[in-house]
């Protein structure tokens, strides 16, 4: 299969900026390339086909170029409606592979997260599982690292993260990380902590609780 690689994966920009997204094919696809725009919860919208042909109704600020293996999508002057995720797709071969996407986000100012930790509810413990939640509120940029420690032992493979879409008012993100354990495992340990690293923090922030003392 022909693989498609997009860069960057995220692009932070302001209204009026000129932005360029690159798509590379693992082998020549001539000009059999399409570009799509997608917004959360919406179907993809075709912007460009045959590498540089503008789909009907698409504003002329969208410019496609390239052939062979290297392609670009340029937005000449970014508008508020253009903050979205962009995908390239080859259709030289029947497999019609997509790139992994480039998210064009609003460039914000660095903001440190507010961090909170929540123990499992008694109600949940009755069901035999325990979820500990670490909540990071209103931070920018999106990159944040959450590490779980149980009795100071680093946990891996038993947590899941969920990040909100960028807030339209202040350009920040929020994130929740959920550590899931069986009730039996949860009750074997005392100190539960989440450690957060972010560009807006001069050093990592740790929030913790002692089981049974909440």
């Amino acid at each position: 299969d022909i693989q498609m690689t997009q860069s960057p994966s995220t692009l932070s920009a302001s209204v009026g900026d000129r932005v360029t997204i690159t798509c590379r094919a693992s082998q020549s696809i001539n000009t059999w390339l399409a570009w799509y725009q997608q917004k959360p919860g919406k179907a993809p919208k075709l912007l460009m086909y045959k590498a540089s042909s503008l789909e009907s109704g698409v504003p002329s600020r969208f410019i496609g170029s390239g052939s062979g293996t290297e392609f670009t999508l340029t937005i000449s002057s970014l508008q508020p409606d253009d903050f979205a995720t962009y995908y390239c797709q080859q259709y030289n071969s029947d497999s019609k592979m997509f790139g992994q996407g480039t998210k064009v986000e609003v460039k914000g100012t660095v903001a440190a997260p507010s961090v909170f930790i929540f123990p499992p509810s008694d109600e949940q413990l009755k069901s035999g599982t325990a979820s500990v939640v670490c909540l990071l509120n209103n931070f920018y940029p999106r990159e944040a690292k959450v590490q779980w420690k149980v009795d100071n032992a680093l946990q891996s493979g038993n947590s899941q993260e969920s990040v909100t879409e960028q807030d339209s008012k202040d350009s920040t993100y929020s994130l929740s990380s959920t550590l899931t354990l069986s009730k039996a495992d949860y009750e074997k340990h005392k100190v539960y902590a989440c450690e957060v690293t972010h560009q807006g923090l001069s050093s990592p922030v740790t929030k913790s609780f002692n089981r049974g003392e909440c």
């Epitope: 059999w32 399409a34 179907a43 993809p44 075709l46 086909y49 045959k50 789909e55 797709q89 259709y91 019609k96």
Partner: nanobody, 121 residues
Framework: QVQLQESGGGLVQAGGSLRLSCAAS????????LSWFRQAPGKEREFVAV????????FYSDSAQGRFTVSRDDAKNTVYLQMNSLKPDDTAVYYC??????????????WGQGTQVTVSS
């Protein structure tokens, strides 16, 4: 305005079957190829199968070949994806899309919102 609406997704055990439907409105599909794609969390959207214009057959991805069958009912303006011998790896949101012109362009001007397929082991 062209609209595509997928249905038929759900939770199924490994080895089971599902039949997805994609109903089109606003465009007569008989002159167009319709394709199925899927997207698993954190992965690229990938091609599954295409139902070319009636009489022109179908094409499948390697992962769908032999297990999935795409068909179309132009009178009902609907395309189907019959999925058999499902595996946990088939868990994804499944989308249908219609070609942007009558000559298998391979670019798609309209997409459905998707239907979730979850295969449990």
């Amino acid at each position: 305005q062209v609209q595509l609406q997928e249905s038929g997704g759900g939770l199924v055990q490994a080895g089971g079957s599902l039949r997805l439907s994609c109903a089109a409105s606003g465009r007569t599909i008989s002159r167009y190829a319709l394709s199925w794609f899927r997207q698993a969390p954190g992965k690229e959207r990938e091609f599954v199968a295409v139902a070319r214009r009636s009489g022109d057959g179908a094409f499948y991805s390697d992962s769908a070949q032999g297990r999935f069958t795409v068909s179309r009912d132009d009178a009902k303006n609907t395309v189907y994806l019959q999925m058999n011998s499902l595996k946990p790896d088939d868990t994804a949101v499944y989308y249908c899309a219609i070609d942007s012109d009558t000559f298998y362009s391979g670019s798609y001007d309209y997409w459905g919102q998707g239907t979730q397929v979850t295969v449990s082991s």
